[in-house]
């Protein structure tokens, strides 16, 4: 038994036929010693007398609000809730399995940007006697603060014969660092109480993995002279992180009729305009995704083709984002070739995802603690890799990126990746390895040597352990190169001489 909140206790029960249950001793919160009686819920039947009451809790009939009285006066209450465990698994009767992105997904969370603000939601078919409370933190062993509001009923839907209720909650990390590479996941804990049943649900994620931008805004069409083509332009959504030269999006533009089966024109672009072929009765749709990290695509923003009247061209805000404040010289050399670094770091992002695209769909934290990759270097808040830090002095950040590149380059060339099980011959790990080396050489000024971080001895003996470690390293590398790519994109746009 444990205390959920003041005067509310949860009794954990192994739930099987003829289970012995749990013996619980309740103590009346009073200085009185004599003449105390106990009742349960609305019943006037006296269950026992004295300052303590010992009960055997086996089923829901034994749970409820126990009240101690003296001479018709209520002294205190203790509400007992039951938490069922069947075959070693805690019950999940209250919430509905959303089955996306995998089975046993009860809580789903999304963030519109990197500000540390996110929304979680869950579904239930229960309409009454239901309460939720939500707690969250960054990390669990030394938790950092995340503040969550109250869970509210956000939608009701009819599904067949049943009504489905959606609840949601908004949370905000207390001291978020949008530009940093997350090393500890956000933990979300939801306590659910239905009548006398208690259940708890948890979710663990990095903000980067739950990013889903809002749709692009202000779609405009401009027909091109003497052509079937139309120039479509749009802008970054207002809710997306700024500056856009750092937090860049990529876009998918599609022209399609009302039916998904109809023919279509489709093009991907990093710009905020594109030229497509419009057809009568078709619509042009645009959606957005983080340019450097493969999180979710936004919903589509759409405009009908027939509306392609004379409106202005694209003035999207994905451009440079400011003047060209010059980079302070790195000791032993000049500023890096920002544009070359940008191109190579973007290539690294692509390679890191193609090296293991499905890594994102594996919950690797099930196989170990949250610090599975705490040995790898992370770009942290104080490393100066945010837009302001880069403007002040990019040297600190570039040194950190260089250290990370060397570290990962050595890891990819180590026994972890060269040992059994052999990598598939078509694995892009080789290209990734070469590109890491290429970028680190581009970054290392001539005749100057930054100190590099010691590679930990991470050589597991079992092939399955090696496989798991590869996944974790690649997953971590995806996050690292995304931050590096943002740094170089921003540098190329704002710091290049």
């Amino acid at each position: 038994i444990w205390e959920l909140k003041k005067d509310v206790y949860v009794v954990e029960l192994d739930w099987y036929p003829d289970a012995p249950g749990e013996m619980v001793v309740l103590t009346c919160d009073t200085p009185e010693e004599d003449g105390i009686t106990w009742t349960l819920d609305q019943s006037s039947e006296v269950l026992g007398s004295g300052k303590t009451l010992t009960i055997q809790v086996k089923e829901f009939g034994d749970a409820g609000q126990y009240t101690c009285h003296k001479g018709g006066e209520v002294l205190s209450h203790s509400l007992l809730l039951l938490h069922k465990k069947e075959d070693g698994i805690w019950s999940t009767d209250i919430l509905k399995d959303q089955k996306e992105p995998k089975n046993k997904t009860f809580l789903r969370c999304e963030a519109k940007n990197y500000s540390g603000r996110f929304t979680c939601w869950w579904l239930t078919t229960i309409s009454t006697d239901l309460t939720f409370s939500v707690k969250s933190s960054r990390g669990s062993s030394d938790p950092q603060g995340v503040t969550c509001g109250a869970a509210t009923l956000s939608a009701e839907r009819v599904r067949g014969d049943n009504k489905e209720y959606e609840y949601s909650v908004e949370c905000q990390e207390d001291s978020a660092c949008p530009a940093a590479e997350e090393s500890l996941p956000i933990e979300v804990m939801v306590d659910a109480v239905h009548k006398l049943k208690y259940e708890n649900y948890t979710s663990s994620f990095f903000i980067r993995d739950i990013i889903k931008p809002d749709p692009p805004k202000n779609l405009q069409l401009k027909p091109l002279k003497n052509s079937r083509q139309v120039e479509v332009s749009w802008e970054y959504p207002d809710t997306w992180s700024t500056p856009h030269s750092y937090f860049s999006l990529t876009f998918c533009v599609q022209v399609q009729g009302k039916s998904k089966a109809e023919k279509k024109d489709r093009v991907f672009t990093d710009k905020t305009s594109a030229t497509v072929i419009c057809r009568k009765n078709a619509s042009i749709s645009v959606r957005a995704q983080d340019r450097y990290y493969s999180s979710s695509w936004s919903e589509w923003a759409s405009v009908p083709c027939s509306g392609s009247g004379s409106s202005r061209g694209g003035s999207g805000s994905g451009g440079s984002g400011g003047g060209g404040s010059k980079l302070r010289a790195v000791p032993g050399g000049s500023s890096p070739a920002w544009t070359q670094c940008q191109q190579l770091s973007q290539k690294l992002c692509t390679l890191a995802w193609s090296a293991h695209p499905l890594v994102g769909h594996m919950d690797l934290r099930e196989e170990g603690d949250e610090e599975t990759t705490n040995d790898v270097p992370h770009i942290q808040c104080g490393d100066g890799c945010d837009p302001q830090g880069l403007r002040d002095n990019s040297q600190f950040c570039l040194q950190r990126i260089h250290q990370g590149l060397i570290f990962y380059e050595k890891l990819l060339g180590s026994d972890i990746f060269t040992g059994e099980p052999s990598l598939l011959p078509d694995s892009p790990v080789g290209q990734l390895h070469a590109s890491l080396l290429g970028l680190s050489q581009l970054l290392q000024p001539e005749g100057h040597h930054w100190e590099t971080q010691q590679i930990p001895s991470l050589s597991p003996s079992q092939p399955w352990q090696r496989l798991l470690l590869r996944f974790k390293i690649l997953r971590s590398l995806q996050a690292f190169v995304a931050v590096a790519a943002r740094v170089f994109a921003h540098g190329a746009a704002t710091l290049s001489p």
Epitope: E262, K263, K264, D270, I277, R279, S354
Partner: antibody, heavy 118, light 107 residues
Framework: QVQLVQSGAEVKKPGASVKVSCKAS????????LHWVRQAPGQGLEWMGW????????EYAPKFQGRVTMTTDTSTSTAYMELRSLRSDDTAVYYC???????????WGQGTMVTVSS | EIVMTQSPATLSVSPGERATLSCRAS??????LHWYQQKPGQAPRLLIY???QSISGIPARFSGSGSGTEFTLTISSLQSEDFAVYYC?????????FGGGTKVEIK
């Protein structure tokens, strides 16, 4: 399954015109875009243009603008590509291809060899 | 127009070995890049679309990667039926253009 069957080989004199046909089957003709791509002997692929059989809309590569006409006959599910003012360097295999996506080529015809020779 | 450059022009590989084909665009084309295989006397066939998306019915040994200006087609373990010419094609803007092709031949 989706299939494209093209007309037979042609031999033409310089300055003449050629009209190659491409009969589609296995799908609703107006549901796919139709492209024409050519390949000179021992050379690479060259895109000529596309037509939307639903409305007759066309887009031609600048190189062929004014010299090529693409048409369709929805009653027979057939597409046509006419190339005028033929020159010897128009000697090539001409392919029609179809796709629901406009910008790449999924289903190809078997090709029609057009030889331009005096 | 966007110029597509493929390298090498010819690649000599032994059966069972891995082949890596490159395609470079004259300007950034995001992931608007597709790969085709053509055997002598046959029409080309689509292998990969939008840089890395696989086609049903195409063996898993064919994979694509890249974005921007540099793209790669990898054939993990060459089979006898894979010796052919491979073309890349950009769909970023009209006119649609192809690379000059890479001939993969038996070493």
């Amino acid at each position: 399954q989706v299939q494209l069957v093209q007309s037979g080989a042609e031999v033409k004199k310089p300055g003449a015109s050629v009209k190659v046909s491409c009969k589609a089957s296995g799908y609703t003709f107006t549901d796919y875009y139709l492209h024409w791509v050519r390949q000179a002997p021992g050379q690479g692929l060259e895109w000529m243009g596309w037509i939307d059989p639903e409305n007759g809309d066309t887009e031609y590569a600048p190189k062929f603008q004014g010299r090529v006409t693409m048409t369709t006959d929805t009653s027979t599910s057939t597409a046509y590509m006419e190339l005028r003012s033929l020159r010897s360097d128009d000697t090539a295999v001409y392919y029609c291809n179809a796709n629901k996506e406009l910008r790449y080529f999924d289903v190809w015809g078997q090709g029609t060899m057009v030889t331009v020779s005096s | 127009e966007i110029v597509m450059t493929q390298s090498p022009a010819t690649l000599s590989v032994s059966p069972g070995e891995r082949a890596t084909l490159s395609c470079r665009a004259s300007q950034s084309i995001s992931i608007n890049l597709h790969w085709y295989q053509q055997k002598p006397g046959q029409a080309p066939r689509l292998l990969i679309y939008f840089a890395s998306q696989s086609i049903s019915g195409i063996p898993a040994r064919f994979s694509g990667s890249g974005s921007g200006t540099e793209f790669t087609l990898t054939i993990s373990s060459l089979q006898s039926e894979d010796f052919a010419v491979y073309y890349c094609q950009q769909s970023n803007s009209f006119p649609l253009t192809f690379g000059g092709g890479t001939k993969v031949e038996i070493k």
